[in-house]
Interface confidence: low
């Protein structure tokens, strides 16, 4: 057979081949970082020619291009600099608002050597919509300029880029786009390990908080997993063995499947594990209908003796088929359980496609997508029960739109990535769950089921019980310390008789704690100010209690997350490098905030937080309250930046005994706690017996109800003090 | 093609400081990393930091923490070395290299600057 | 913090394959470069990720890395491969060199 010509080297670059200079050989270019080769890659044909995939003209020099990354196409409410057409490696484009308009996202962005851009999408937003202002990213249009509840945006690529993520986003109820945000990529663009690590792990996690993770015995020897029947996860892995996968990378991709499975099997989660390989044919090598998928020694076993050989008869790309064998596998599962049973409908499903190109026969892949959608009833309710990813590996043939097709859309997560090799996949593997900090204690998990219990449904409530009868709240931040108000212990610092009374699903009364030690604000006077004519003080109303015994966590019990901290950073499936003003401006984003807390009685009640100048007029009230403050001058004295200020409207008050309690808000199904029930001006218990009665403040009283909180944004550099080395802290 | 030129050779007292320049040509100077590697007499190689030439962020081995200070000029292409608080065991010849952080290696070095330092 | 360790030298005849070795601690999880560097001159990269070569370098310069050892192999050495060689990874954001090995091209 003839041998294709070696006249094929790249200027600047290096060049490897499949199978030498015989036909079938695939050559593949590589530049140094920075650089991109152009053609990417050439296939020895058996005529004994070189042919490039996709060219239309005879064969061209190759050659090393520089990388460069796309330009803002428009850029709402504010300007950008430098306009260029495209920006280098190592290039910078800034971003300022216009007046009244705050600033989301990185301020000044760096073009990165894979021709992506670093930090995140800037947004100039006035917070005026039901949905924040999506954004456009840099390379997109835009069409749709309203972020109404039902509101739908479009967006499209310029020029020749790709774009991954959703191309149109709907605002929802909840105040969230729908999908995931679009990024307009150039077509040689790949992604770094250490942005496909947290973006994997981050999504991953989520999934994995989702499906119960509960507590579970382990053998001492060997790592067999005890099945119960709470969530359930199955996990399919498909690994191509196409003919353009080297031995070598299968072997890569064999091993990051077994870190994978090694990873997810030491969650505290129920987990089947079905092998697929595939070339022209898939061949099912583990299936999650074998009981030995719930077994990780068994799993790897199986895993080990996938042979790169299986497919040496047929070495197309048929991820049609591979995907359908998914679909089969769900569909005799679902007869097995029968379509109707909890058992069936309650299974999450994760599939994995590692695959090194695009697919070549047997149909759209997207089908099998369809299929297995429609089987596993995937609607905006049950969004959560399938997480497809698409993980392109080498440059070469990767086609980044059926990677986005085939990637789960879910806000704020990305499920479609190309890497640049396989040993960029293996870190990828290595590094996306760091198991250690994430099981039992996953914080901000409630249950939100309509039939689940008030402490189901917010688990990091406790109650404080100290010497007096006036009891006070307080939130679980880790399975030891809760976070409350100082003011419940300005009678004395013995805490001896103390207790605080932690969920127990044992017990609809919880279970009592002593407390080992008591960390009470040294800032905090509540007479402070008395000289001033301000007869009570709340500057600086926090404490923390170290309990004396670790809580078990269980679904009446699990800290909440506090934002700033890495834990939060997951569950509000953020970027490794965010900062704690990157949870308050997500968190904290518009004027006007919903946000709840605890009342006596268990129930969760609806507030609003009001920022920027609705803060002001919130707070200005307190100048009408002469009986607490008789010659008052500014409001400031009394109600500081430290905090929030809820109470307009129809807003619930706190109670006196509600105070220490959790003010917390909901994002991507987690719960964060963004302050602390401070004091108010209006009391909705007083002189009522029942702790389930509640009376609303008449519409004429002067000076209306106004209620202050702990803005835990503002309390930093003292909860890091002492919470350092229980919480991991992001930078301010 | 690509050229490294690095300031000449330097004679410092303990505890002075020196500064070592290098003008990069040939290439786009901002889609690089610079590199600062120093090789004591007889020693091995011993990495010192990095600048990015695009906006002059750096990153310092801990070793040098303290003491070294890392600057480009772009209108000029030439990056610079400072170390101060001079040592005799900071007796050396240094390498400023071009490259990128992470896997691809520093694939030009400049011709290296040997600074004595000695009472 | 991290180390690779390097044999102090080789020697063999021309001819020969020479093999240096550079261990670290899951080093194979992390890509490695080497670099030539001959008496009174700047060091030349020889190998990057693993085992791609620089333009210019010739053929018989490879590299691999799995487990905690790279090696660095040169066949049908010649006396002008006659240098020290350095491997180099990265550990966070900190470059590591290990100690180098003096490759001596006997006769």
């Known amino acids: 057979a003839p041998s294709c010509p070696q006249n094929v080297n790249i200027s600047g670059g290096t060049f490897t081949l499949s199978h030498g200079w015989a036909p079938g050989s695939l050559l593949t270019y590589s530049c140094p970082q920075g650089l991109y080769p152009s053609p990417a890659s050439r296939l020895c044909k058996s005529s004994g020619q070189w042919q490039t995939p996709g060219a239309t003209r005879s064969l061209s020099k190759a050659v090393c291009k520089p990388v460069r990354c796309p330009a803002p196409v428009s850029f709402e409410n504010g300007i950008y600099t430098p306009r260029l057409g495209s920006y280098p490696v190592g290039g910078n484009v800034s971003f300022e608002c216009e007046d009244g308009f705050i600033l989301r996202g990185s301020p000044v962005r760096q073009c990165r050597p894979n021709g992506m851009w670093d930090g995140e999408t800037a947004v100039c937003d006035n917070g005026a919509g039901h949905c924040p202002n999506p954004g456009i990213s840099l390379g997109a249009v835009r069409t749709g300029f309203r972020f109404g509840h039902g509101d739908k945006v479009r967006y499209r690529c310029s020029s020749n880029l790709v774009l991954t993520g959703s191309s149109e986003r709907e605002c929802q109820g909840n105040g969230v786009w729908s999908g995931t945000e679009p990024i307009c990529r150039q077509p040689y663009s790949y992604d770094f390990p250490e942005d496909v690590a947290p973006a994997l792990g981050t999504s991953f996690s989520h999934m994995l908080g989702a499906t119960n993770p509960t507590q579970k015995t382990k053998e001492s020897l060997g790592r067999k997993i005890q099945i119960q029947r709470s969530g359930h996860l199955n996990l399919y892995l498909l690994l191509d063995c196409s003919q353009s996968v080297s031995e070598n990378d299968f072997l890569i991709f064999k091993e990051s499947a077994s870190l994978m499975v090694d990873r997810i099997f030491s969650f505290e989660i129920n987990v089947s594990v079905a092998i697929i390989t595939f070339a022209s044919e898939p061949k099912v090598l583990m299936s999650v209908l074998n009981d030995n998928s719930r077994d990780m020694t068994e799993v790897i076993s199986s895993l080990e003796n996938a042979n790169y050989k299986d497919h040496e008869n047929g070495t197309g790309t048929n991820t049609y088929a591979a995907l359908n064998s998914v679909y089969l596998m769900m569909n005799n599962q679902m007869r097995l359980l029968g379509m109707e049973t909890m058992a069936w409908q309650e299974i999450r499903h994760a599939i994995i496609l590692l695959t090194d190109g695009k697919s070549n026969m047997g149909g759209s892949p997207k089908t099998a997508v369809d299929h297995i959608r429609e089987i596993l009833n995937i609607n905006q309710k049950r969004n959560d029960y399938l997480d497809i990813y698409a993980i392109g590996v080498g440059k070469l043939d990767v086609d980044w739109r059926e990677l986005n097709e085939l990637g789960s859309k879910k806000d704020g997560e990305r499920h479609a990535f190309i890497l640049q090799d396989t040993k960029a996949l293996h870190q990828v593997f290595e590094h996306m769950l760091d198991v250690s900090k994430l099981t039992d204690t996953i914080c901000g998990v409630g249950n939100m089921s309509a039939n689940a219990s008030d402490q189901e449904r917010t688990p990091w409530h406790v109650t404080i019980k100290p010497k007096s009868q006036e009891t006070c709240r307080g939130a679980l931040i880790s399975d030891q310390w809760v976070l409350t108000a100082a003011h419940c212990f300005r009678d004395g610092n013995d805490h001896s008789l103390w207790r605080v009374n932690v969920g127990d699903p044992k017990s609809q009364w919880g279970k009592e704690f002593l407390i080992e030690k008591a960390v009470i604000s040294p800032g905090f006077d509540v007479f402070a100010k008395k000289n001033q004519g301000i007869l009570e003080f709340y500057g600086d109303d926090i404490a923390l209690l170290k309990l004396a015994q670790k809580v078990k966590m269980s679904t009446h019990a699990r800290p909440i997350c506090l934002p700033c901290t890495m834990e939060a950073n997951l569950a509000l499936r953020r970027p490794q490098g965010s900062t704690c003003r990157d949870h308050e401006n997500e968190l904290l984003n518009k004027q006007s905030v919903p946000a709840h807390f605890v009342a006596l009685n268990g129930s969760k009640l609806n507030i609003n937080l009001k920022m920027g100048v609705e803060w002001t007029s919130c707070a200005e009230v307190v100048s009408q309250e002469k009986t607490m403050f008789p010659n008052l001058t500014d409001v400031r004295e009394v109600v500081t930046d430290q905090f929030l200020c809820s109470g307009t409207q129809e807003d619930e008050s706190p109670c006196k005994g509600e105070s220490g309690g959790a003010v917390f808000l909901e994002r991507r199904f987690r719960f964060f706690q963004v302050g602390l029930v401070s004091w108010g001006l209006y009391n909705p218990c007083l002189g009522s017996a029942d702790k389930n009665s509640r009376k609303r403040a008449p519409r004429s009283k002067v000076p209306p109800p106004r209620d202050f909180h702990i803005n835990l944004f503002r309390m930093q550099p003292w909860l890091r003090q002492h919470l350092g080395d229980v919480l991991n802290f992001l930078p301010l | 093609q690509v050229q490294l030129v690095q300031s000449g050779a330097e004679v410092k007292k303990p505890g002075a400081s020196v500064k070592v320049s290098c003008k990069a040509s040939?290439?786009?100077?901002?889609?690089?990393?610079m590199y600062w590697v120093r090789q004591a007499p007889g020693q091995g190689l011993e990495w010192m930091g990095i600048?990015?030439?695009?906006?002059?962020?750096?990153t310092y081995a801990q070793k040098f923490q303290d003491r070294v200070t890392m600057t480009r000029d772009a209108s000029t292409t030439t990056v610079y070395m400072e170390l101060s608080s001079l040592r005799s065991e900071d007796t050396a010849v240094y390498y400023c290299?071009?490259?990128?952080?992470?896997?691809?290696?520093?694939?030009?070095w400049g011709q290296g600057t040997l600074v004595t330092v000695s009472s | 913090s991290y180390e690779l360790t390097q044999p102090p030298s080789v020697s063999l005849s021309p001819g020969q394959t020479a093999s240096i070795t550079c261990s670290g601690d899951k080093l194979g999880n992390k890509y490695t470069c080497w670099y030539q560097q001959k008496p009174g001159q700047s060091p030349v990269l020889v190998i990057y990720?693993?085992?791609k070569r620089p333009s210019g370098i010739p053929e018989r310069f490879s590299g691999s890395n799995s487990g905690n050892t790279a090696t660095l192999t040169i066949s049908g050495t010649q006396a002008m491969d006659e240098a020290d060689y350095y491997c180099q990874t990265w550990d966070s954001s900190t470059a590591v060199f290990g100690g180098g090995t003096k490759l001596t091209v006997l006769g």
């Open positions: 290299a071009r490259g990128y952080e992470g896997s691809y290696g520093f694939d030009h």
């Open positions: 990720q693993d085992n």
């Open positions: 600048i990015t030439p695009s906006g002059g962020s750096t």
């Open positions: 040939g290439y786009s100077f901002t889609t690089y990393y």
